[in-house]
């Protein structure tokens, strides 16, 4: 594949990554799949500046990110190390709350209205953000 040098139409560039901000809602797994089909992934927040950039674009709206603990420990969808990486949880979070009555706990992370993170039921239909790195090779076949 060829290296992507600029962001696709309707995506926003920031610090060598491209971002796409949804305006509708999906369950976390559906949002994750949507980004993968776009040769991207749910947003992975690695710095204070990226946090600020994303929260500016999403506004005070619950929005999925690429962080989950569906298999036990918290993991970023692109393999970024969770333990040593940037975190911005709300106080008392994540709490894997079972009291919502929807079955199970809370295994997927989202931005809240103040930008900080919360864990919630993965089936909730929240907005989402896709991210892809400009320097990574595109999956599209090269032009002949």
């Amino acid at each position: 594949g060829s290296e992507r040098t600029c962001c696709p139409v309707n995506w926003v560039e920031h610090e060598r990554s491209c971002y796409w901000f949804s305006r509708s809602g999906k369950a976390w797994a559906d949002a994750d799949n949507y980004c993968r089909l776009e040769d991207a992934h749910l947003v992975v927040v690695t710095s204070w500046e990226e946090q600020k950039f994303v929260q500016h674009h999403i506004g005070p709206v619950n929005t999925w990110m690429g962080l989950h603990d569906q298999n036990g420990p918290w993991k970023w969808v692109d393999g970024t190390d969770y333990e040593t990486g940037f975190k911005n949880w709300r106080p008392e979070q994540p709490d894997d709350w079972y009291g919502h009555g929807l079955g199970g706990g809370e295994d997927c992370a989202h931005f809240t209205d103040d930008g900080r993170w919360n864990d919630d039921v993965c089936q909730r239909p929240y907005r989402w953000v896709c991210e892809t790195e400009l320097d990574k090779a595109s999956q599209e076949p090269p032009l002949l």
């Epitope: 204070w48 500046e49 600020k52 950039f53 929260q55 500016h56 005070p60 940037f86 975190k87 106080p91 103040d114 930008g115 900080r116």
Partner: antibody
């Protein structure tokens, strides 16, 4: 009402240490990040450090990195600034301030405590 | 680190005047720009955050605008209690740097 009261300032010799405290009341201290900001006599404001609500993350100004340590004790509703290897240019009024989560601005401030570094 | 500059460094204006203070960042800070007012011997007071969000209890004669690198604080009709020093601060990237301040006094 929100109240922040700094203490621990005073006169100290260059190279020595000092610990400032900031006692918080009127809000849930453990839910807020906190900042230290200083102001040298007759000069402008200089941001010093911030600490996450749970102490898990800390950031510092380059001028104090490696010498100052921000910490907190949520059980005592108290913020601290441990200042080591003090220099004359650290002479200032030190303010603690509460963080507004979305913007990282400082919405409530203490009255300040004066630190004078002099031989 | 992001450098913040303010202009003018001081200004004299009569009560009732419209005054503007500009703040410039050395790189794009989106809209993470805060304005503070400080009177002699007092702690700073937050007036505006995220460039244009007026804080509760702050008179509506204060307004903020701008994005990216260029920002403005405007006082539509200067009142006696507005004579003070005004600081901008970026909170996009640590360290959260302040501008050098603008002193507003009575003409």
């Amino acid at each position: 009402q929100v109240q922040l009261v700094e203490s621990g300032g005073g006169v100290v010799q260059p190279g020595r240490s000092l610990r400032l405290s900031c006692a918080a009341s009127g809000f849930t201290f453990s839910s807020y990040a906190m900042h230290w900001v200083r102001q040298a006599p007759g000069k402008g404001l200089e941001w010093v450090a911030v600490i996450w609500f749970d102490g898990s993350d800390k950031y510092y100004a380059d001028s104090v990195k490696g010498r100052f340590t921000i910490s907190r004790d949520n059980s005592k509703n108290t913020l601290y600034l441990q200042m080591n290897s003090l220099r004359a240019e650290d002479t200032a009024v030190y303010y603690c301030a509460r963080d507004r989560a979305y913007s990282s601005s400082s919405d409530y401030w203490g009255q300040g405590t004066l630190v004078t570094v002099s031989s | 680190d992001i450098q913040m500059t303010q202009s003018p460094s001081s200004l004299s204006a009569p009560v009732g005047d419209r005054v503007s203070i500009t703040c410039r960042a050395s790189q794009n800070i989106i809209n993470y720009l805060n304005w503070y007012q400080q009177k002699p011997g007092k702690a700073p007071k937050l007036l505006i955050d995220v460039a244009s969000n007026l804080q509760g209890g702050v008179p509506s004669r204060f307004s903020g605008s701008g994005s990216g690198t260029d920002f403005t604080l405007t006082i539509s009709s200067l009142q006696p209690e507005d004579f003070a020093t005004y600081y901008c601060q970026q909170s996009y990237s640590t360290p959260f740097t302040f501008g050098p301040g603008t002193k507003v006094d009575i003409k």
